[in-house]
């Protein structure tokens, strides 16, 4: 039985040209996290494997940085980065947990961030 829950940054916004940290946290389960995949729409952005470390997609190599933790940092944001992002936790023995974050990249200089995991 899957008892875990994923807490995410939820709906967040950031300025064009800036950076943002995407964070998810899996709680309420003792399952072992084997791998976390980060996806945007239908693209795989990055993989964090518990044993092997991080790999960033060649498509996003220059704009995505691993961490902090199991999170992901998106840099040099453009309006095209607006959309849904998913953290997919592969766990044993529970299976797969998925969290959703919606990022809006704003042209304006005022961008409000989500309440949790926000960048100072």
């Amino acid at each position: 039985m899957m008892t875990g829950t994923i807490e995410t940054t939820g709906n967040i916004s950031a300025e064009k040209g800036g950076s943002i940290i995407l964070q998810c946290h899996l709680s309420s389960t003792t399952a072992q996290v084997t791998q976390v995949n980060w996806e945007q729409q239908d693209q795989l952005l990055a993989i964090c494997n518990a044993d092997l470390g991080w790999h960033i997609s060649p498509s996003f190599k220059d704009r995505v940085a691993p961490g902090p933790g199991l999170g992901l940092t998106l840099q040099s944001l453009t309006v095209n980065d607006t959309g849904e992002y998913f953290c997919i936790y592969h766990t044993y023995p529970d299976g797969t947990y998925t969290g959703r974050i919606f990022l809006e990249v704003l042209e304006s200089s005022v961008a409000e961030h989500g309440a949790r995991f926000q960048i100072p």
Epitope: Q35, Q41, D42, Q43, L44, I47, G53, H55, S57, P58
Partner: antibody, heavy 119, light 107 residues
Framework: EVKLVESGGGLVQPGGSLKLSCAAS????????MYWVRQTPEKRLEWVAY????????YYPDTVKGRFTISRDNAKHTLYLQMSRLKSEDTAMYYC????????????WGRGTSVTVSS | DIVMTQSHKFMSTSVGVRVSITCKAS??????VAWYQQKPGQSPKLLIY???ARHTGVPDRFTGSGSGTDFTLTITNVQSEDLADYFC?????????FGAGTKLELK
């Protein structure tokens, strides 16, 4: 069992066009990113195209950009490669390959379909 | 483009021995390297990904190592069915590139 079966290869004249297909079975096709890779007569492997699982994103090397188009039909579990303005240097065995769910490597390859560009 | 150099086009070996096939990247690719085996008349098969992780069903006599620019595929206790072409590939950045291959043959 993962199975990828390419078809559509053949002999074509320089400047001509050809459309390759790759029929996938044994896995949930729409969950996987896919590639086309070719192998020249000298046995060199060259990446030709990438398509994301939903078909939204595509990438190509400069050698084929603007001439080749990768696409997919998830309902038909089929990957395609439309090749136009073909050159003699496009002569090769063309393979479709699946991207691993664990990484960005190519974990399963089809048997290939041969393309010869010659007058 | 990142060039993957396999310095030995051919390597001669004997059954039961240990052989190491090397691959050098023209720039740092971290551990974004795979190794493929191709037997005559067949398509390439994934052996190693993430520079050192063995693909499902691959015998443990195949071992991948290295990071940055220098990578090695080691086959311990070579079997006759291991005689094939071996290719390295980087997937750190586009365009994805392969080494020219190393043919493992009997002495």
């Amino acid at each position: 069992e993962v199975k990828l079966v390419e078809s559509g290869g053949g002999l074509v004249q320089p400047g001509g066009s050809l459309k390759l297909s790759c029929a996938a079975s044994g896995f949930i096709f729409s969950d996987y990113h896919m590639y086309w890779v070719r192998q020249t007569p000298e046995k060199r492997l060259e990446w030709v195209a990438y398509i994301s699982k939903g078909g939204i994103s595509t990438y190509y090397p400069d050698t084929v950009k603007g001439r080749f188009t990768i696409s997919r039909d998830n309902a038909k579990h089929t990957l395609y490669l439309q090749m136009s303005r073909l050159k003699s240097e496009d002569t090769a065995m063309y393979y479709c390959a699946r991207q691993s769910s664990y990484d960005f490597a190519m974990d399963y390859w089809g048997r290939g379909t041969s393309v010869t560009v010659s007058s | 483009d990142i060039v993957m150099t396999q310095s030995h086009k051919f390597m001669s070996t004997s059954v039961g021995v240990r052989v190491s096939i090397t691959c050098k990247a023209s720039q740092d690719v971290g551990t974004s390297v795979a190794w493929y085996q191709q037997k005559p008349g067949q398509s390439p098969k994934l052996l190693i990904y993430w520079a050192s992780a063995r693909h499902t069903g691959v015998p443990d006599r195949f071992t991948g190592s290295g990071s940055g620019t220098d990578f090695t595929l080691t086959i311990t206790n070579v079997q006759s069915e291991d005689l094939a072409d071996y290719f390295c590939q980087q997937y750190s950045s586009y365009p994805l590139t392969f080494g020219a291959g190393t043919k493992l043959e009997l002495k």
